[in-house]
Interface confidence: low
């Protein structure tokens, strides 16, 4: 902790500017008024303060706002955000998407830190739901964000937000998460025509029930094997050989290469050998 010392004559800061980089830590503590700092936070990032000097500036803000910083200060924290602990951030009430973007920008290119995770959690919980603009922003910065949420958290995603989801945002989602997201996607894309609908829904199909797969098999969708392999085993098992053939179209030949893997293996074991033989792939039930 920096000792309280009087500010030397003539060194009292009238504004936040480059002259402060020559101040020692104790001079910053003594000569920079915390309220002045708070109102001119936007200038701090343009000044090449050392990490030690930033510690002093953070300390001054902490003293001025022991209950947590106001959003007007948070929005302009810039690199000072990297000095915050999750404990600091839990005191904040961030409601503006612009503030969230400004802070995510500071951390851009790095993995999601506990500070950022706490910030996002505060922001989303404060809004009450993960709306489209927020999801758009978060997945732009962190493509894996959606799959880092629990099924319970995903349940607060409104169907309208699903339009912001890109296929790569779902790469690391597990079946429990897709179970929650699929019905929302189905609702979001329900007014699209067949081929367009399939392009949009494809990434979410790991959460699709049997009846939806049966319906898709009637629409000449030509599902690729990568998508088929991600389907729920319990949803695939009741499909007939004819339905799988229609679902996969020209990709049906790929079943041979996947015959030892779930869900193909389990599905093959469920089928009559006569039916499998109609595929001409040499699959053995």
């Amino acid at each position: 902790e920096v000792e309280k010392t009087a500010c030397p004559s003539g060194k009292k800061a009238r504004e936040i500017d480059e002259s402060l980089i020559f101040y020692k830590k104790w001079e910053l503590e003594a000569c920079v008024d915390a309220a002045l700092l708070a109102t001119q936070m936007d200038r701090v990032n343009a000044i090449p303060f050392t990490y030690e000097q930033l510690d002093v500036l953070k300390h001054k803000l902490d003293e001025l706002y022991p209950q947590g910083y106001p959003e007007s200060v948070i929005q302009h924290l810039g690199y000072l955000f990297l000095k915050m602990s999750p404990e600091d951030i839990r005191k904040w009430n961030v409601t503006s998407l612009e503030t969230l973007k400004a802070l995510l920008e500071v951390n851009k290119g790095h993995e999601m830190s506990p500070q950022v995770a706490t910030l996002i959690d505060r922001f989303v919980k404060g809004r009450g739901q993960l709306d489209k603009d927020t999801l758009d922003t978060l997945t732009a910065f962190y493509p894996g964000y959606l799959c880092s949420l629990s099924p319970e958290e995903l349940s607060s995603v409104p169907p309208s937000s699903i339009w912001a989801v890109r296929p790569q945002d779902l790469d690391t989602c597990d079946p429990r998460q897709l179970d929650v997201l699929y019905p929302k996607a189905r609702l979001a894309f329900q007014n699209m025509n067949g081929s367009e609908y399939f392009v949009k829904i494809q990434s979410f199909l790991g959460g699709a029930p049997t009846e939806d797969l049966k319906a898709l098999s009637q629409q000449n969708v030509s599902m690729d094997l990568a998508t088929f392999m991600k389907l729920r085993t319990d949803a695939v098992l009741p499909l007939t050989v004819a339905e799988v053939q229609k679902l996969l179209g020209p990709h049906v030949e790929g079943l041979k290469a996947e015959e030892r893997h779930r869900p193909v293996r389990d599905w093959i074991l469920r089928q009559r050998q006569d039916d499998l033989d109609t595929l001409g792939l040499g699959l053995q039930g």
Partner: nanobody
Framework: QMQLVESGGGSVQAGGSLRLSCTAP????????MDWYRQAAGNQREWVSS????????SYADSVRGRFTISKDPAKDTVYLQMNSLKPEDTAMYFC????????????WGKGTLVTVSS
């Protein structure tokens, strides 16, 4: 009321190591963001490290980064603080804290374990 229990403190020479443990009997550590704090005699309590429940990511105060490591064993509902290259200025009472990972969540503290580092 949940009670966290710290252990593993003790006396050690500068440069030595200790591993602190924090258990929450009857409570799942996966429900918590887990923090370690410390308080040296006559000083304010200061944050040392955090481990988030959501994705297991970790964070450290500048004064301990590179020397301390926070981790957890979900099977035992125990959170650890591995402290290496200890310095005399690390001497303090160490506390663990569980912040129930919810908006405006409850938090729970342990009674602390003392770490003394002599030069």
């Amino acid at each position: 009321q949940m009670q966290l229990v710290e252990s593993g403190g003790g006396s050690v020479q500068a440069g030595g190591s200790l591993r602190l443990s924090c258990t929450a009997p009857g409570f799942t550590s996966s429900d918590c963001d887990m923090d370690w704090y410390r308080q040296a005699a006559g000083n304010q309590r200061e944050w040392v490290s955090s481990l988030l429940s959501t994705d297991g990511s970790t964070s450290y105060a500048d004064s301990v980064r590179g020397r301390f490591t926070i981790s957890k064993d979900p099977a035992k509902d125990t959170v650890y603080l591995q402290m290496n290259s200890l310095k005399p200025e690390d001497t303090a009472m160490y506390f663990c804290r569980c912040v129930v990972a919810e908006w405006g969540g409850m938090d729970y503290w342990g009674k602390g374990t003392l770490v003394t580092v002599s030069s």
